[in-house]
């Protein structure tokens, strides 16, 4: 036999096993130009001293071979005595280490069977009532063809599917979409209504993200706040990476999830921009305020599960930074400036009462005064901090008030609000004897103390009714009572306590009279 | 000259097997396609399986899962394993090659 022909002789090696794991198999056979063909096919197992023949059954029920060799493409005319017009029937056997494999057949009319491409080019993948749709377009020249498809997930092997016929300039399909694994999808195709035609070679691999993106663990941190009223927010745990099915690890576009930090500052509810979203790979800093952090993960498909934390406020407080004057026309306070044209936000609430209820004003961008202050004041008629009770300021900064990462914390303290001089009078002022020539006086607490860091101290002034005389005893903030000593048998004393504060004098409170009795001996 | 010679047909009970041979000269079975046909008196005569180069099988629907055709390449004879046999099995069964057809035997299934 010549060896661009088929042989009609029997192949120069024993009958054909039936199947085995490895051998000959997807054998595809196309006319590639006006007058000739070509088959080729895949080879499984070692490749060492095989012979391939390519098997061919005319519809005459004659039968012929070609002798391959160690290749797996062979091409042949129309005149090497296979019938192109009418069906005939195609298989590969192998000889190798003393046994024949043979591939599954295909039955075609040779002259009809055009090679077709797998879908080339860039594959759409988009959700469709909870499945997955693919869309590309047709390859050139290949309107009209059967399409199939193959998937598997990290843990499954390849299960086939079908996408049914397609007839346009575009082709489509409908494929299972996964809720918590990625999969990886492979198409082909064939010739529409041409018996037997070959299918394409599978399509490079469409990785796909499962319907809901993995929830992210992750754990933050936060520093302490720094001296530029700065915390860093630190990422303790990375969120768990999907796990990807063999064809998709490495690089796998599309089944990528992105994580995003979406910040929402819960302080100073005046200012322009409570939200940012960020990268998750892109750790901000924070003011001291209180925040509430979610990571949202998501894909092609969209968002999924999101995870919030709260990461309350920083409170440490600065008892001195703040200088608050009292005036008949309002109020002035006076701290340390930051820069030049910074906006300060300056939120209050009274203390003991929910979050929710803070109150806040925002300056105009400012420059330090001479003095190197900045200042916010406010009318006795704005109502600001007009009650009498304790209040807790925070004072914040920023550059650019519209970028919420760049506020920074300038002091937290507390102020007593209204007229805290007269408020903070000491009640309940009692004296009692405690030897020949001293007494205790004692009196309720300030509402004052119930304001960290505003009393200064207390003052208790005693005076001798007889010469006049005059003596002042200041008092810790944390004590109410104090010993008064020297004083004489007899004589009319009124004693009086004050409760002042670093800016303020106190108002006294009402006069107590009192003598220690003279004591007559026996 | 070709030549194709049927052998193994007989009664046998419902459910019953048969093997029957089909000798081949003058053609090679592993170059030619070998056919089995059966036909009942008054039918049409229907194919019942194919071997194609001594390796490719085909089976008609009816007997898928029950016949098994196979080839002997050093005998050059093809056979047809008939199991779970019924009685609508009961026919002429001839194999043909090329356009050459032996004379047939005779299968008969009934209890």
């Known amino acids: 036999c010549r060896t661009s022909e088929c042989c009609f002789q029997d192949p120069p090696y024993p009958d054909a096993d039936s199947g085995s794991a490895s051998g000959p198999r997807d054998l595809r056979c196309y006319r590639i130009s006006s007058d000739r063909y070509e088959c080729s096919w895949q080879y499984e197992g070692p490749t060492a001293g095989v012979s391939h023949f390519l098997r061919c059954c005319l519809s005459s029920g004659r039968c012929c071979y070609f002798a391959a060799g160690s290749a797996t493409r062979l091409q042949f005319s129309d005149q090497a005595g296979v019938s192109v017009l009418y069906t005939v029937t195609l298989w590969v056997e192998s000889w190798a280490r003393n046994q024949t494999e043979k591939s599954p057949e295909v039955t075609l009319q040779l002259y009809n069977s055009v090679k077709y491409e797998p879908p080339l080019g860039d594959i759409k993948v988009s959700k469709l009532a909870g499945q997955l749709r693919m869309e590309w377009e047709t390859p050139d020249n290949q309107v009209g063809a059967e399409v199939q498809f193959r998937h598997r997930t990290p843990s499954s092997p390849w299960k086939l599917g079908d996408c049914g016929p397609q007839d346009d300039d575009t082709e489509s399909c409908l494929c299972p979409l996964e809720m918590n694994v990625a999969q990886e999808f492979q198409l082909r195709r064939r010739q529409l209504g041409s018996q037997g035609s070959s299918w394409s070679k599978w399509s490079s691999p469409v990785c796909v993200p499962p319907e809901n993106p993995p929830q992210p663990q992750v754990r933050f941190s936060v520093e302490q706040l720094g001296q530029d009223g700065r915390r860093r927010l630190t990422l303790k745990e990375q969120p768990t990476q999907l796990e990807l099915p063999e064809g998709c690890q490495g690089l796998a576009p599309g089944t990528e999830v992105t994580y995003r930090l979406q910040l929402h500052m819960l302080s100073c509810p005046c200012k322009a921009k409570a939200t940012r979203t960020l990268h998750l790979g892109k750790m901000p800093y924070l003011s001291g305020a209180a925040y509430n952090v979610a990571v949202i993960s998501s894909n092609q498909f969209g968002p999924g599960l999101n995870q919030t934390w709260h990461i309350p406020a920083d409170t440490h407080t600065e008892p001195v930074a703040l200088n608050i004057s009292v005036g008949t026309n309002g109020t002035t306070m006076y701290w340390p400036a930051r820069a030049q044209s910074m906006t300060y936000c300056i939120e209050w609430q009274p203390v003991g009462q929910d979050g929710g209820l803070a109150t806040c004003s925002l300056t105009a961008p400012q420059d330090p005064d001479p003095a190197g202050m900045a200042t916010y004041s406010w009318s006795r008629e704005s109502g600001a901090m007009g009650q009498e009770k304790c209040y807790y300021i925070t004072i914040f900064a920023s550059a650019h008030p519209e970028k919420l990462t760049l506020w920074s914390t300038v002091l937290s303290t507390y102020h007593f609000g209204g007229n805290a001089s007269a408020a903070g009078t000491p009640h309940h002022v009692s004296v009692k004897n405690h030897s020949l020539d001293s007494v205790s006086v004692d009196w309720a607490p300030s509402l004052l103390s119930t304001c960290p860091g505003v009393l200064k101290e207390y003052v208790v002034r005693c005076r001798d009714e007889d010469s006049k005389q005059v003596s002042e005893h200041p008092v810790q903030p944390t004590e109410t009572q104090v010993t008064l000593s020297g004083l004489r048998a007899g004589v009319a004393y009124t004693v009086q306590v004050r409760a002042d504060t670093a800016w303020l004098r106190g108002v006294w409170s009402q006069p107590q009279r009192f003598s220690i009795e003279v004591q007559v001996s026996d | 000259e070709v030549q194709l010679v049927e052998s193994g047909g007989g009664l046998v009970q419902p459910g019953g097997s048969l093997r029957l041979s089909c000798a081949v000269s003058?053609?090679?079975?592993?170059?030619?396609?070998v056919n089995w046909y059966r036909q009942a008196p008054g039918k049409q005569r229907e194919l019942v399986a194919l071997?194609?180069?001594?390796?490719?099988?085909k089976y008609a629907d009816d007997v898928k899962g029950r016949f098994t055709i196979s080839s002997d390449s050093a005998r050059n004879t093809v056979y047809l394993q008939m199991n779970s046999l019924r009685p609508e099995d009961t026919a002429v069964y001839s194999c043909?090659?090329?356009?050459?057809w032996g004379q047939g035997t005779q299968v008969t299934v009934s209890s």
């Open positions: 043909s090659a090329l356009e050459y």
């Open positions: 071997i194609m180069g001594g390796a490719i099988t």
């Open positions: 003058g053609i090679s079975v592993r170059s030619s396609v």
